[in-house]
C-alpha cells in the first residue's frame, strides 16, 4: 500500500510492482508501495549468518559512471530476527534501508521461504525522501496468523543490477497440536492384532499422545508423537481416537470405528431381467458385505418340476455387476434360483429362492426318418417322417414346414408347405416331370421353426414310368440318395 504523508495519510492497496514513491520539492515524507521488476538481471547477496555483528547485507554496487563515481554500499538495517506468537494473533514486522538518491531506481519486495510474496498481501512501504537520501521502511503485517504463515521472511531490494537482501525474520506461529496423521477406520479380522497411528506437531513441541478406546484412555503414560498403538485383537466393534497435548493445550483426533469382519448377509431382491428358451438373466442386490469386500457369487439353479431328480446346477461369477445370465437351460421349464456371495470370511446364506421359467423355443432337431414316394397313379409325392424327440422339441409342436425344390433342365423352383401338428405324413402334387424333387422338413413350435432335415431327392420321370421304391433320409455320411426309375 502507499500513502503520501502531507496533511493526511491515504492508504492504497499493495501491488507487486515497481517501487514507488514521490519526491516532492518540499521533501515531506511519503508512503508508497513495494516491488517491481526492472529490466536488469539480478545478483543475489546471501543472508548473513545469524549472530554476525552486522546490520544487514551489504552490497557494494559495481556500476560506475564514465567519471568512475562509485556508489556507496547499501545494507538493510538489522531488525528483530525471531517472532514467536500464538495462532490467530496479529503480527507486524519491517525492514528498513536508506538509499542515496543517486541510485535513482530501486524496487523492493517481500519473500517468504524463497518465494516472492505477490498480490494483495498486507505490505506497506513508507518512503521518506530528502535532498540526498530516501529512507525506506517496508512493513509486513498479518492480521490473524495461521500455521501456514510460519517461515523465514526477507526483504529484497533490486538496485543497479544487484539485489540487496535483508536478514531473515523467522515467524513461529504457536498453537494447539495439529494432526499430520490421524487414525484411520479399519475392518479387521476377529482376534487379530492391528496398528493405529497418530502424529501431531506444534509448535510448540513436544507433542504427547494419549490413545482413547470407547471413551476410555488406553495408555496411562503419554507417548511422544508420532505414536503407534498395537491392538492385540477385538471381538466386537470399537471406536478409537487420540489426544495430542502440548503447552498450548490439547487437540482430539476424529474418532474412528474399527469393525470386525464377518460373513456377508444374503443377497436380496433377486429378480428376473429377461428369459429366453435356454437362458435366464437375473440380477440381485448384494446384502451387507460384513466389512470385507465381496469376492464372488454363486447362482444355484434347481428344476422346479416335482418329477425332476432335484439336482442343483451351480454357476460361479464375479461379485460385480450383480447380474448373471444362466445358460444351457431347457425350454419351457420351471426353475428355482438362489444367489449366495462370499467375502474373505466365508459364504453368505442363500437368498430367498425365486421361481423362473424359460420360454418356448424353436425345435433344436429336425424330424427323423424322412421318406419320399412317388404315387404315379395320383401324380403325387407322398412324404413320411417321425416327429423329433419331445425333449428336443423345445415347445409344443404346432406343425411342420416342408420345402420341396424341383429341378429340371437348369430350372429350379422351391415351394413351401405347412402341415398341422398331428400328421406325420404329407402329399404334394408333382410340379414337373422328368425332374428331381428335393424334400426337407422342419418342425415348428410357437417359438419358431427348427432346423430342416437333410435333403431327400427323388427323380420324377416322364408319364408312363413306374415307381418301384421310395427315397428316404440317408444314413449319416452317405451321399444324397437319388432314386432313378
Amino acid at each position: 500500500a502507499i500513502t503520501e504523508a502531507r496533511e493526511e495519510a491515504k492508504p492504497y492497496p499493495l501491488f507487486p510492482g515497481p517501487f514507488p514513491g514521490s519526491l516532492q520539492t518540499d521533501h515531506t515524507p511519503l508512503l508508497s508501495l513495494p516491488h517491481a521488476s526492472g529490466y536488469q538481471p539480478a545478483l543475489m547477496f546471501s543472508p548473513t549468518q545469524p549472530g554476525r555483528p552486522h546490520t544487514g547485507n551489504v552490497a557494494i554496487p559495481q556500476v560506475t559512471s564514465v567519471e568512475s563515481k562509485p556508489l556507496p554500499p547499501l545494507a538493510f538495517k538489522h531488525t528483530v530476527g525471531h517472532i514467536i506468537l500464538s495462532e490467530h494473533k496479529g503480527v507486524k514486522f519491517n525492514c528498513s534501508i536508506s538509499v542515496p538518491n543517486i541510485y535513482q531506481d530501486t524496487t523492493i519486495s517481500w519473500w517468504k521461504d524463497g518465494k516472492e510474496l505477490l498480490g494483495a498481501h498486507h505490505a506497506i512501504t513508507q518512503f521518506y525522501p530528502d535532498d540526498e537520501v530516501t529512507a525506506i521502511i517496508a512493513s509486513f503485517s498479518i492480521t490473524s496468523v495461521q500455521r501456514s504463515d510460519n517461515g523465514s521472511y526477507i526483504c529484497k531490494m533490486k538496485i543497479n543490477n544487484e539485489e540487496i537482501v535483508s536478514d531473515p525474520i523467522y515467524i513461529e506461529v504457536q498453537g494447539l497440536p495439529h494432526f499430520t496423521k490421524q487414525p484411520e477406520s479399519m475392518n479387521v479380522t476377529r482376534n487379530t492384532a492391528f496398528n493405529l497411528t497418530c502424529q501431531a506437531v506444534g509448535p510448540p513441541e513436544p507433542v504427547n499422545i494419549f490413545w482413547v478406546q470407547n471413551s476410555s484412555r488406553v495408555n496411562e503414560q503419554p507417548e511422544k508423537s508420532p505414536s503407534v498403538l498395537t491392538v492385540p485383537g477385538l471381538t466386537e466393534m470399537a471406536v478409537f481416537s487420540c489426544e495430542a497435548h502440548n503447552d498450548k493445550g490439547l487437540t482430539v483426533s476424529k474418532g474412528v470405528q474399527i469393525n470386525i469382519k464377518a460373513i456377508p448377509s444374503p443377497p436380496t431382491e433377486v429378480s428376473i431381467r429377461n428369459s429366453t428358451a435356454h437362458s435366464i438373466l437375473i440380477s440381485w442386490v448384494p446384502g451387507f458385505d460384513g466389512y470385507s469386500p465381496f469376492r464372488n457369487c454363486s447362482i444355484q439353479v434347481k428344476e422346479a418340476d416335482p418329477l425332476s431328480n432335484g439336482s442343483v446346477m451351480i454357476f460361479n461369477t464375479s461379485a460385480l455387476p450383480h447380474l448373471y445370465q444362466i445358460k444351457q437351460l431347457q425350454a419351457l421349464a420351471n426353475y428355482s434360483i438362489g444367489v449366495s456371495c462370499m467375502n474373505e470370511i466365508g459364504w453368505s446364506a442363500v437368498s430367498p429362492w425365486i421361481l423362473a421359467s424359460t420360454t418356448e423355443g424353436a425345435p433344436s432337431v429336425a424330424p427323423l426318418n424322412v421318406t419320399v414316394f412317388l404315387n404315379e397313379s395320383s401324380d403325387n409325392v407322398d412324404i413320411r417322417w417321425m416327429k423329433p424327440p419331445t425333449k428336443q422339441q423345445d415347445g409344443e409342436l404346432v406343425g411342420y414346414r416342408i420345402s420341396h425344390v424341383w429341378q429340371s433342365a437348369g430350372i429350379s423352383k422351391e415351394l413351401l408347405e405347412e402341415v398341422g401338428q398331428n400328421g406325420s405324413r404329407a402329399r404334394i402334387s408333382v410340379q414337373v416331370h422328368n425332374a428331381t424333387c428335393t424334400v426337407r422338413i422342419a418342425a415348428v413350435t410357437r417359438g419358431g421353426v427348427g432346423p430342416f432335415s437333410d435333403p431327400v431327392k427323388i427323380f420324377i420321370p416322364a408319364h408312363g414310368w413306374v415307381d418301384y421304391a421310395p427315397s428316404s433320409t440317408p444314413a449319416p455320411g452317405n451321399a444324397d440318395p437319388v432314386l432313378i426309375i
Partner: antibody, heavy 120, light 107 residues
Framework: QVQLVQSGAEVKKPGASVKVSCKAS????????MNWVRQAPGQGLEWMGW????????TYADDFKGRVTFTTDTSTSTAYMELRSLRSDDMAVYYC?????????????WGQGTTVTVSS | DIQMTQSPSFLSASVGDRVTITCKAS??????VTWYQQKPGKAPKLLIY???TRHTGVPDRFSGSGSGTDFTLTISSLQPEDFATYYC?????????FGQGTKLEIK
C-alpha cells in the same frame, strides 16, 4: 524553481543524426534519473528509456536499442539524447522528463520539448 | 510489455459536466498508474500518481481510482481549462508504457 530546458527545433535529412540537450536547474541533477519520451504528430507518448545521471548508466526501450544514445554532463547538469539513422517516422517532439524519486517511475517535471523534422 | 488501453479516444462534454476516462492494463500493475494532462503544443503535466494520489497543485476536482488492471480518472465538474488530452501510464515494470490518449473536447 525546478525546470528542464531543451535545445531548439532541428531539421534533419533521412539517415542523419540528431542530438537533443536537456539542461536541468533548481535541483541536484545527479539525484534524479532522466527519461526521454517522444510524441509523433497527432500521436501518443512513447517512452524511449532513461539514464542514471549519477552513474551514466542508460536503459533503452527495445524499439530504440542500437540507434539511440543517452549521455549526461554533470558539470553542466545536462542530459543528451542522440538518435541516429533518422527516418521519416522519427519526426516527433522529443521530451526529457525527470524521474520523480529513487522509488518511482513517473515524471514530475518535463522539458518543453524539441521538435525534430526529418525531410529530404 | 504491458499494454495500456484508454477509452474513450474522444470525449465531448460541457463545462460543469462530470467525466470519467478509463484505462485498462493488459496485466496486473497494482497501483502503479499515473495520469498526465497535455494541452496542444505543451509538455504533459503530472496529475495523479499511485492511481489515486493527486500531485502538488492539482485541483481536487481531479480524482483517480482503481488497482490491478482497471483504472479511472474522473473530473467532477469540468472547467474551461480542463479541455485537453489525458494519458495514463503504468510503471509496474519496464518498459514504461502509456495509453493512447483521450481527447476531451468542448461539446
Amino acid at each position: 524553481q525546478v525546470q528542464l530546458v531543451q535545445s531548439g527545433a532541428e531539421v534533419k535529412k533521412p539517415g542523419a543524426s540528431v542530438k537533443v540537450s536537456c539542461k536541468a536547474s533548481g535541483y541536484t541533477f545527479t539525484n534524479y534519473g532522466m527519461n526521454w519520451v517522444r510524441q509523433a504528430p497527432g500521436q501518443g507518448l512513447e517512452w524511449m528509456g532513461w539514464i542514471n545521471t549519477y552513474t551514466g548508466e542508460p536503459t533503452y526501450a527495445d524499439d530504440f536499442k542500437g540507434r539511440v544514445t543517452f549521455t549526461t554532463d554533470t558539470s553542466t547538469s545536462t542530459a543528451y539524447m542522440e538518435l541516429r539513422s533518422l527516418r521519416s517516422d522519427d519526426m516527433a517532439v522529443y521530451y526529457c522528463a525527470r524521474k520523480s524519486t529513487v522509488v518511482s517511475r513517473y515524471f514530475d517535471v518535463w522539458g518543453q520539448g524539441t521538435t525534430v523534422t526529418v525531410s529530404s | 510489455d504491458i499494454q495500456m488501453t484508454q477509452s474513450p479516444s474522444f470525449l465531448s462534454a460541457s463545462v460543469g459536466d462530470r467525466v470519467t476516462i478509463t484505462c485498462k492494463a493488459s496485466q496486473d500493475v497494482g497501483d502503479a498508474v499515473t495520469w498526465y494532462q497535455q494541452k496542444p503544443g505543451k509538455a504533459p503535466k503530472l496529475l495523479i500518481y499511485w492511481a489515486s494520489t493527486r500531485h502538488t497543485g492539482v485541483p481536487d476536482r481531479f480524482s483517480g481510482s482503481g488497482s490491478g488492471t482497471d483504472f479511472t480518472l474522473t473530473i467532477s465538474s469540468l472547467q474551461p481549462e480542463d479541455f485537453a488530452t489525458y494519458y495514463c501510464q503504468q510503471y509496474r515494470s519496464y518498459p514504461l508504457t502509456f495509453g493512447q490518449g483521450t481527447k476531451l473536447e468542448i461539446k
